[in-house]
Interface confidence: medium
């Protein structure tokens, strides 16, 4: 049984997709697409602010962890990368770039350094780090 | 500028995609799509033969590494996972499930155990392992 007709404008032909298969995206070219979210890992080391600016310039934001189920690919990510989580000293909370507060039990926060920014590490860990320290970073774009 | 009209049959409406964005796939539901290849990481530990059978049952194969550029997402994979690489004792070569020989300089083969199967480890390393040892595994499906 086939469904989901995809109009491929490049070749102007119909491609048939089995019910169990689907397209993912849309995402920026050569980004990773998973459960209709787009991710890209950047090798160059930048501080948190530069990393944020780099993601924004690509119409994305630094990684936001919102669901262990929908983002289970993050379990297997090696090393440490800036994500969009910052510490608000006034109330002691951790919040994402969009202003939302970090949900309980999503990340294990580990105080590696003194700082107000957080690195993502495998198995849903967040390592506190000084925001001016250069690190690799993960950009994310949520599809509509 | 917008292009690539996508016919969304679910809502029967047109979604416009910017030129710099694209859909990836098709892939099995909830698989990772990257540069039009589909990947899935399986948590349950199986031996190499069971892992191969699991991938085949999903119309896929165990991971084949064919390009550091097209598969650079594999750089950051944590831990060790079965891939579709086996040792042919008669001629000493390493070959993929499809019969093709491992290209030089794609993987650094490290003999950590006695065996004729290989685990994928981050940064394009292959760890030799006994084929009957249970490990997690990576399935891959190349899109047409």
């Amino acid at each position: 049984i086939w469904s989901a007709v995809f109009l491929n404008s490049l070749f102007n032909q119909e491609v048939q997709i089995p019910l169990t298969e689907s397209y993912c995206g849309p995402c920026p070219k050569n980004w990773i697409c998973y459960k209709n979210n787009c991710y890209q890992f950047f090798d160059e080391s930048k501080n948190w602010y530069e990393s944020q600016a780099s993601c924004m310039s690509q119409n994305a934001s630094l990684l936001k962890v919102y669901s262990k189920e929908d983002q289970d690919l993050l379990k297997l990510v090696k090393s440490y990368h800036w994500m969009g989580l910052v510490h608000i000293p006034t109330n002691g909370s951790w919040q994402w770039e969009d202003g939302s507060i970090l949900s309980p039990n999503l990340l294990t926060i580990i105080e590696m350094q003194k700082g107000d920014c957080a690195l993502y590490a495998s198995s849903f860990k967040g390592y506190i780090e000084n925001c001016s320290t250069p690190n690799t970073y993960i950009c994310m774009q949520r599809t509509v | 500028i917008w292009s690539a009209v996508f016919l969304n049959s679910l809502f029967n409406q047109e979604v416009q995609i910017p030129l710099t964005e694209s859909y990836c796939g098709p892939c099995p539901k909830n698989w990772i799509c990257y540069k039009n290849n589909c990947y899935q990481f399986f948590d349950e530990s199986k031996n190499w033969y069971e892992s191969q059978a699991s991938c085949m049952s999903q119309n896929a194969s165990l991971l084949k590494v064919y390009s550091k550029e097209d598969q650079d997402l594999l750089k950051l994979v944590k831990s060790y996972h079965w891939m579709g690489l086996v040792h042919i004792p008669t001629n000493g070569s390493w070959q993929w499930e499809d019969g093709s020989i491992l290209s030089p300089n794609l993987l650094t083969i490290i003999e950590m155990q006695k065996g004729d199967c290989a685990l994928y480890a981050s940064s394009f390393k292959g760890y030799i392992e006994n084929c009957s040892t249970p490990n997690t595994y990576i399935c891959m499906q190349r899109t047409v």
Epitope: K78, S79 | Y80, I110, E111, M112, G115, S123, N130
Partner: antibody, heavy 123, light 107 residues
Framework: QVTLKESGPTLVKPTQTLTLTCTFS??????????VGWIRQPPGKALEWLAL???????RYSPSLESRLTITKDTSKNQVVLTMTNMDPVDTATYYC???????????????WGQGTMVTVSS | QSVLTQPPSVSVSPGQTASITCSGD??????VSWYQQKPGQSPVLVIY???KRPSGIPERFSGSNSGNTATLTISGTQTVDEADYYC??????????FGTGTKVTVL
Amino acid sequence: QVTLKESGPTLVKPTQTLTLTCTFSGFSLSTSGVGVGWIRQPPGKALEWLALIYWDDDKRYSPSLESRLTITKDTSKNQVVLTMTNMDPVDTATYYCAHRTGIAVAGIAFDIWGQGTMVTVSS
Amino acid sequence: QSVLTQPPSVSVSPGQTASITCSGDKLGDKYVSWYQQKPGQSPVLVIYQDTKRPSGIPERFSGSNSGNTATLTISGTQTVDEADYYCQAWDSSSLYVFGTGTKVTVL
């Protein structure tokens, strides 16, 4: 001739972070297959592997200590640095760095070890 | 976590053979290395890949590994062989694992 030498504080207070440096000579940590590992040994007890860094900057950690450890390398200075956070008196040990042979078939062996540095954790 | 179990101590007379065992689940499927550590000194690799000796290690040191047990054998044991000995293996879950250690006493 391959040599390695560990350096760092001999005394750290509980909850502090330990930083150890391994300075080596006789090999390059950019040669394919090569790695440098850290192993510790509490007084009168067995060896315990902590971490390893490969030539390609791939890092491996003991699963039980992974959240506390960071290993880095400076190829130009021929140095490998291990940091261990939240030190506790049970972390009192001699800390060794060791060269992981570049021979593929001897992949699990540490063929040359440093002299070790004793670290005491006490307030 | 993998566990490699060694006898705490082995006693041997000079010139006799000392055998040190290292036990672990399906250890014969893995490569085993052995290290010698004399008091106040760093460990020295004496056997790697079950049976191979690094250059400079005397021929009296040999290794074997099958089933669940690896064995380090010192033939014609000398007083200079008095030391602690550790086996070591690797697996994809625990990575580099050392044995519990065996003290060899040459009587």
